[in-house]
């Protein structure tokens, strides 16, 4: 039979007969030696006759008295085996044993679930000596029990190298259900089923679960814990909780919000971080992600020139770091830029469009049709060219840079000339006779110096030569033209 004491048990004398009596005054269950009279308080039962030593772990002392009678076996007396009480109540229980006075230094230790209880526990051992035996009563009290106090408690005593162990006292702390698993917030796809889990434990068991959605009960009858709720799908955000019921009452889980994944909101605050002739660095602030992580973003770029054909360039990039360098743009051009981002559901609308401009760049092509003449009468070299196409000037021409290299008998000298943007010819004076002059020309804007044209070489003879002819930029493929005059 399970021996149990419930918290309603009334205080009663601790020790009848020869032991000093004490009354329990704290309204907590008090378990003690059975009464010699055989009387036991209500709701406290022992599995064997009161006062009889139990047959468990006993020590049979070898010492004999003067009359050489062997001493009776030593054993803890029976006490109540099972205590059921509510959380935060107090409890006191004890072990008792009568030990012949011939034994010295007997100590009782308390153990819970196989581990010795040391330190900060309210364990008191009292000794009541008589002529031949000493009654030892070890009391253990807990002022405010918690669930962690649940378990099996025993007393141990070492005597004569023998260990005496009491019967266990089972403490069962009952309370409201305690959640071991509560539903968790989730982001779910619209109209798609998903599961929520709720688990709670006693004691006392059983624990029954009710599910609540937006304050309406989902199941009108309880389900045994643990319970899994299959939600058949949602079209809008909902709040779920579960109620756990047992004989002590009800505990309600935290309410969790289940959000419906949606397309993101458009990005905001698209701004220009940096502009160059052919690129624009933009940043943006992502909009609300629609309860689903951003996957990537799309930058849309339109020429803002009303005469342009209105085509849109699209650049895809990762969602982080909310920064993108748009490349391959024309210099000195106006663009409208918008950003859109996507999650697993779809693309956001495009952000508000912003206007951005590229700066002037260095020209992207060299002047064309470069021609070089020797004007012997004035001892000059005349250079002519055609300006690069306007589209490829990448800015407003401010002039040209002419490189002329003079090579003669192991001597090489490079000179640079800057000329204004008006016109397409220049005259440079001959630096060295009997030498080769190599001419290259680059267009210049405020954005910088463009590429130099292919070199055009002209031979400058010694004084007195009469014939001369122009030297010009060759047809593509002739990399190193030389014209000897």
């Amino acid at each position: 039979a399970i021996t149990e004491a419930r918290e309603e048990a009334k205080p009663y004398p601790l020790f009848p007969g020869p032991f000093p009596g004490s009354l329990q005054t704290d309204h907590t269950p008090l378990l003690s030696l059975p009464h010699a009279s055989g009387y036991q308080p209500a709701l406290m039962f022992s599995p064997t006759q009161p006062g009889r030593p139990h047959t468990g772990n006993v020590a049979i002392p070898q010492v004999t008295s003067v009359e050489s009678k062997p001493l009776p076996p030593l054993a803890f007396k029976h006490t109540v085996g099972h205590i059921i009480l509510s959380e935060h109540k107090g409890v006191k229980f004890n072990c008792s044993i009568s030990v012949p006075n011939i034994y010295q230094d007997t100590t009782i230790s308390w153990w819970k679930d196989g581990k010795e209880l040391l330190g900060a526990h309210h364990a008191i051992t009292q000794f009541y000596p008589d002529d031949e035996v000493t009654a030892i009563i070890a009391s253990f009290s807990i002022t405010s029990v918690q669930r962690s106090d649940n378990g099996s408690y025993i007393c141990k005593m070492k005597i004569n190298n023998e260990e005496i162990v009491s019967d266990p006292i089972y403490i069962e702390v009952q309370g409201l259900p305690h959640f071991t698993k509560q539903p968790e917030s989730m982001n779910v796809t619209r109209n798609t089923a998903f599961n929520l889990t709720c688990q709670a434990v006693g004691p006392p068991e059983p624990v029954n679960i009710f599910w609540v959605q937006n304050s309406s009960r989902v199941n009108e009858q309880p389900e045994k814990s643990p319970s899994v709720l299959t939600v058949p799908g949602l079209t809008e955000m909902a709040v779920f909780s579960c109620e756990a019921h047992n004989d002590k009452g009800l505990t309600v889980s935290k309410g969790v919000q289940i959000n419906i994944k949606a397309i993101p909101s458009p990005p905001t605050e698209v701004s220009i971080r940096n502009s160059t002739a052919h690129s624009i660095l933009i940043s943006w602030v992502p909009g609300f992600d629609g309860y689903s992580p951003f996957r990537n973003c799309s930058i849309q770029v339109k020429e803002a020139d009303p005469l342009s054909n209105g085509s849109v360039m699209i650049f895809n990039t990762s969602a982080l770091p909310h920064l993108y360098q748009i490349k391959q743009l024309q210099a000195l051009a106006n663009y409208s830029i918008g950003v859109s981002c996507m999650n697993e559901i779809g693309w956001s609308a495009v952000s508000p469009w912003i206007l951005a401009s590229t700066t002037e760049g260095a020209p992207s092509v060299a002047p064309l049709n470069v021609t070089v003449f020797l004007n012997e009468s004035s001892d000059n070299v005349d250079i002519r060219w055609m300006k690069p196409p306007t589209k490829q000037q990448d800015g407003e021409l401010v002039g040209y840079r002419i490189s002329h290299v003079w090579q003669s008998a192991g001597i090489s000298k490079e000179l640079l000339e800057e000329v204004g943007q008006n016109g397409s010819r220049a005259r440079i004076s001959v630096q060295v006779h009997n030498a080769t002059c190599t001419v290259r020309i680059a267009a210049v804007t405020r954005g910088g110096v463009g590429p130099f044209s292919d070199p055009v070489k002209i031979f400058i003879p010694a004084h007195g030569w009469v014939d001369y002819a122009p030297s010009s930029t060759p047809a593509p493929g002739n990399a190193d033209p030389v014209l000897i005059i």
């Epitope: 937006n214 309406s216 989902v218 009108e220 009858q221 079209t235």
Partner: antibody, heavy 118, light 106 residues
Framework: QIQLVQSGSELKKPGASVKVSCKAS????????MNWVRQAPGQGLEWMGW????????TYADDFKGRFVFSLDTSVSTAYLQISSLKAEDTAVYFC???????????WGQGTLVTVSS | EIVLTQSPDFQSVTPKEKVTITCRAS?????MHWYQQKPDQSPKPWIK???NLASGVPSRFSGSGSGTDFTLTINSLEAEDAATYYC?????????FGQGTKLEIK
């Protein structure tokens, strides 16, 4: 498989009482509540209420408070609907149906026709 | 209590036609269930929680909606679909049914 089998048709005089039974099989009777639904001739469905098969507690829709009583005998997995002081307007088919999550009536009895006529 | 109004009350339809039955609630509900009933039979569960077809229901049926407006749609009507369809709300007690929509095959 899950089945709800209802008792047969009844012909009653006004003022009499009738008790309709609904025997469940194929599942644990106390796991699901039992609803009662009325359908008057040529009319739509009306929810009368339900009984908690776990606690035995009945819940009645407003129009069905008073003369209508839901009861159980869990030992034979049976729910009952008793109507007292029968009136001609009680003539209808009465259905029992299991009460699932979200008040989904997944299983229905075949219906019991109660005719009240003098 | 929440009043459910179905429309139309009655519809005569030719096979292969698309049919839409609507159920409007007097205030917002969480889910709408649909049941099919044929003469002298008990109602059959048809669509659970707005959009989930019950076991054995043909895929030509679908359900949708939220808040106060819900629909049952039959993509291509077949003769066996002739029946009365009822909506039933979950979310507010007492539970209520719509008055029913009777579909007849021309």
């Amino acid at each position: 498989q899950i089945q709800l089998v209802q008792s047969g048709s009844e012909l009653k005089k006004p003022g009499a009482s009738v008790k309709v039974s609904c025997k469940a099989s194929g599942y644990t009777f106390t796991n699901y509540g039992m609803n009662w639904v009325r359908q008057a001739p040529g009319q739509g469905l009306e929810w009368m209420g339900w009984i908690n098969t776990y606690t035995g507690e009945p819940t009645y829709a407003d129009d069905f408070k008073g003369r209508f009583v839901f009861s159980l005998d869990t030992s034979v997995s049976t729910a009952y609907l008793q109507i007292s002081s029968l009136k001609a307007e009680d003539t209808a088919v009465y259905f029992c149906a299991t009460y699932g999550h979200y008040a989904w009536f997944a299983y229905w009895g075949q219906g019991t026709l109660v005719t009240v006529s003098s | 209590e929440i009043v459910l109004t179905q429309s139309p009350d009655f519809q005569s339809v030719t096979p292969k036609e698309k049919v839409t039955i609507t159920c409007r609630a007097s205030s917002s509900v969480s889910y709408m269930h649909w049941y099919q009933q044929k003469p002298d039979q008990s109602p059959k569960p048809w669509i659970k929680a707005t959009s989930n077809l019950a076991s054995g229901v043909p895929s030509r049926f679908s359900g949708s909606g939220s808040g106060t407006d819900f629909t049952l749609t039959i993509n291509s009507l077949e003769a066996e679909d002739a029946a009365t369809y009822y909506c039933q709300q979950w979310g507010t007690k007492p539970l209520t049914f719509g008055q029913g929509t009777k579909l007849e095959i021309k």
